[in-house]
């Protein structure tokens, strides 16, 4: 009988081992070892035994010892088990963004490593074990599926192999892949809320607000606001899980017509959009025309209001007849019409909304100068030593200058409070003068003396 010692060995790849082959008889006819491995006989051996050193053991092998004794030929094998840690442990790249609530498949590839019976592959989140499987195939591929929540954002996932050689009194060899950081996101199925004017006038400024709630991580969300081809530059305010983008928009005549207002919120690899139609319109203020802005009293004046062809106008609150973009009326200018405002209101329907524009013109009526009994009484009688205020108002446009003189030199203090004395008595010539001419009027002041008893 042939014996081999040790019958089983576990050794590192590339390692060497000494193996003893022995025969049961004292003087074997032949004794040796068959192996494809590099071998060296260690001398001296014994009568019935030989020692061999096997080197550079790269893979599992079963060298065979044989002996030929008088009672027959026999053989015995030694089982060489090679161990080595994997050459590659790699976690497949994670998606750039992973939606919350959707399962994530983790895939790990392991190249090499032996003995495979002792090689385990683990998928980890941080240091938490998600899955533990045997390494099967070359390369071994291990997968597991995990649900993804918001708390997985920024989590590191990795793959680890354990070559457990503790049954052989060796140790536990660990190899860990480079970690991959997961970026999760939650973009609600609801589109953003878009608040904007439905109609917008050329060369005016409007405000657009786009908001969306339930975003995670909100800081990574991007907002795109555009009106037609015009990209808007919003100011973004972030809440806990919400954002609000506010932008000012100014439109030009080239953009007149129906435009699409678009708000897109981009997070991860997904976008939620809201579109809204905005009608851009041009609506100049109506024109109010007076035949002449400045006329003399008694002159006939035509007041005319003209607006946008599709507008309807009202002139001084009176609608055009028939309703339309033009209205006019005729008047004979009186002093009372001086400073009178003529207001034209135009209304235009844009996308179902009524928009209004107003324009006002003032009429100047030239009249006078005038000195009336009502405003400049011809006779005053005042007690001596009483306090009085002489009043005389001249009228006209332009406003006339007024002078009241006695004997051409002594002025009547118009509008001033005076103590009535004898020298105030007399007849005054009041003269009102403007660029339109002059008028005069005599004003007599009588002073009553007190009675002494």
């Amino acid at each position: 009988q042939t014996s081999v010692f040790p019958p089983e060995v576990i050794l590192p790849r590339g390692g060497s081992v000494k193996v003893n082959c022995s025969a049961s008889c004292d003087q074997p006819i032949s004794l040796g070892m068959e192996t494809p491995l590099p071998k060296k006989e260690i001398l001296p051996g014994g009568n019935n035994w030989k020692m061999y050193e096997l080197s550079n053991v790269q893979e599992d092998s079963q060298p065979m010892c044989y002996s030929n004794c008088p009672d027959g030929q026999s053989s015995a094998k030694t089982l060489l088990t090679v161990y080595w840690t994997p050459e590659r442990v790699e976690l497949a790249p994670l998606p750039p963004w992973q939606p919350v609530g959707k399962n994530l498949t983790l895939r790990c590839q392991v190249e090499g490593g032996a003995p495979r019976a002792n090689l385990t592959v683990m998928l980890l989140r941080g240091e938490k074990e998600l899955s533990r499987q045997s390494a099967v195939g070359e390369p071994a591929e291990v997968t597991t599926t995990v649900p993804v929540g918001r708390d997985d954002h920024g989590a590191n996932f990795s793959c680890r192999t354990e070559l457990d050689l503790r049954p052989y009194v060796l140790k536990l060899f660990e190899n860990t892949s480079a970690p991959h950081q997961l970026q999760t996101f939650d973009l609600p199925a609801t589109p953003p809320q878009l608040v904007s004017p439905q109609v917008l006038e050329v060369d005016t400024q409007g405000t657009v607000v786009c908001s969306l709630d339930g975003l995670f991580p909100v800081s990574e969300a991007q907002v795109s606001l555009a009106l037609g081809d015009q990209k808007l530059n919003p100011t973004i305010t972030y809440g806990n899980n919400s954002l609000s983008a506010k932008a000012s928009v100014k439109v030009t005549a080239e953009e007149e017509g129906t435009q699409q207002l678009l708000c897109g919120v981009m997070l991860g690899n997904q976008t939620q959009e809201t579109r809204q139609t905005v009608t851009i319109y041009s609506f100049p203020a109506p024109n109010v025309n007076l035949t002449k802005p400045e006329v003399s009293e008694g002159t006939e004046v035509i007041v005319e209001c003209e607006a946008h062809p599709r507008a309807k106008v009202m002139l001084n609150g009176v609608p055009a007849q028939p309703p339309g973009p033009r209205a006019q009326f005729l008047l004979k200018a009186t002093p009372e019409d001086n400073g009178r405002s003529f207001s034209c209101s135009a209304t235009l329907e844009v996308a179902g909304q009524l928009v209004h524009k107003n324009q006002t013109r003032e009429l100047r009526v030239l009249y006078g100068p005038r000195l009336d009994e009502k405003d400049c009484p011809g006779n005053w009688t005042w007690p001596e030593n009483s306090q009085q205020t002489p009043m005389c108002q001249a009228w006209g446009n332009p406003l006339p200058q007024l002078k009241c003189l006695k004997d051409g030199t002594f002025p009547l203090p118009i509008g001033q409070s005076v103590t009535v004395t004898r020298d105030l008595e007399g007849t005054y010539l009041c003269q009102a003068r403007s660029t339109r001419g002059e008028v005069t009027r005599e004003v007599t002041v009588n002073v009553l003396s007190p009675r002494y008893e």
């Epitope: 081999v4 040790p6 060995v9 576990i10 060497s16 081992v17 003893n20 049954p167 009194v169």
Partner: antibody, heavy 124, light 109 residues
């Protein structure tokens, strides 16, 4: 991972007895050994035999050859058959798992997992 | 026959101290063949050191093995009361001869 011995008993001199070692948490594969070691009351440890988990090849201490036979009965059990027992065989019998540790050449057994032991008493 | 001799059957030391246990072999032992075990009453042995100086998994670094050829030593430093036990050396020899030393009891005071 654990080992458990069973079959220990009180027997008369000259009797035979079979001890069983059951492994759990690991299965048989090449490269490691299951061995039997005994300890007489108040005495030191004494190696009896080892069997290769993959090959089933058994090796004995010189004093145990012929009287003791070690066998692998399944991937998780090994037995030790003992014959012609004497009072000197009274001991706690441990089964142990070990490796044949190789570094720069020839190696040796060492045991990193032991069962709690089973008591064999040989007495008339 | 190959014999492993542990000269001291018992040694004592104080908590925090250091104890050294020697083991001598009648024949040269390859460094990979020598191991040290710790055994407490009523328990199976526990592997401490293998390949003369390699610490087994989970064993504190207070345990240190050294030596080669025929002379080997186990040193236990920063002694704890839990270190009170019997310590065995064990070696393997060419031709599948395996032996345990007689054991050294360590008393911690």
């Amino acid at each position: 991972q654990s080992l458990e011995e069973s079959g220990g008993d009180l027997v008369k001199p000259g009797a035979s007895l079979t001890l069983t070692c059951t492994a759990s948490g690991f299965s048989s594969s090449s490269g490691y050994y299951i061995c039997w070691v005994r300890q007489a009351p108040g005495k030191g440890l004494e190696w009896i035999a080892c069997i290769g988990a993959g090959s089933g090849a058994a090796y004995y201490a010189s004093w145990a050859k012929g009287r003791f036979t070690m066998s692998k009965t399944s991937s998780t059990t090994v037995t030790l058959q003992m014959t012609s027992l004497t009072a000197a065989d009274t001991a706690t019998y441990f089964c142990a798992r070990g490796g044949f540790v190789v570094g720069g050449g020839y190696g040796g057994y060492c045991f990193n997992l032991w069962g709690p032991g089973t008591l064999v008493t040989v007495s008339s | 026959a190959q014999v492993l001799t542990q000269t001291a059957s018992s040694v004592s030391a104080t908590v925090g101290g250091t104890v050294t246990i020697s083991c001598q072999s009648s024949e040269s032992v390859d460094v990979n063949n020598l191991a040290w075990y710790q055994q407490k009453p009523g328990q199976p042995p526990k592997l401490l050191i293998y390949s003369a100086s390699t610490l087994a998994s989970g064993v504190p670094s207070r345990f240190k093995g050294s030596g080669s050829g025929t002379q080997f030593t186990l040193t236990v430093s920063d002694l704890e009361s839990a270190d009170a036990a019997t310590y065995y050396c064990a070696g393997g020899y060419s031709g599948n001869i395996f032996a345990f030393g007689g054991g050294t009891a360590v008393v911690v005071k």
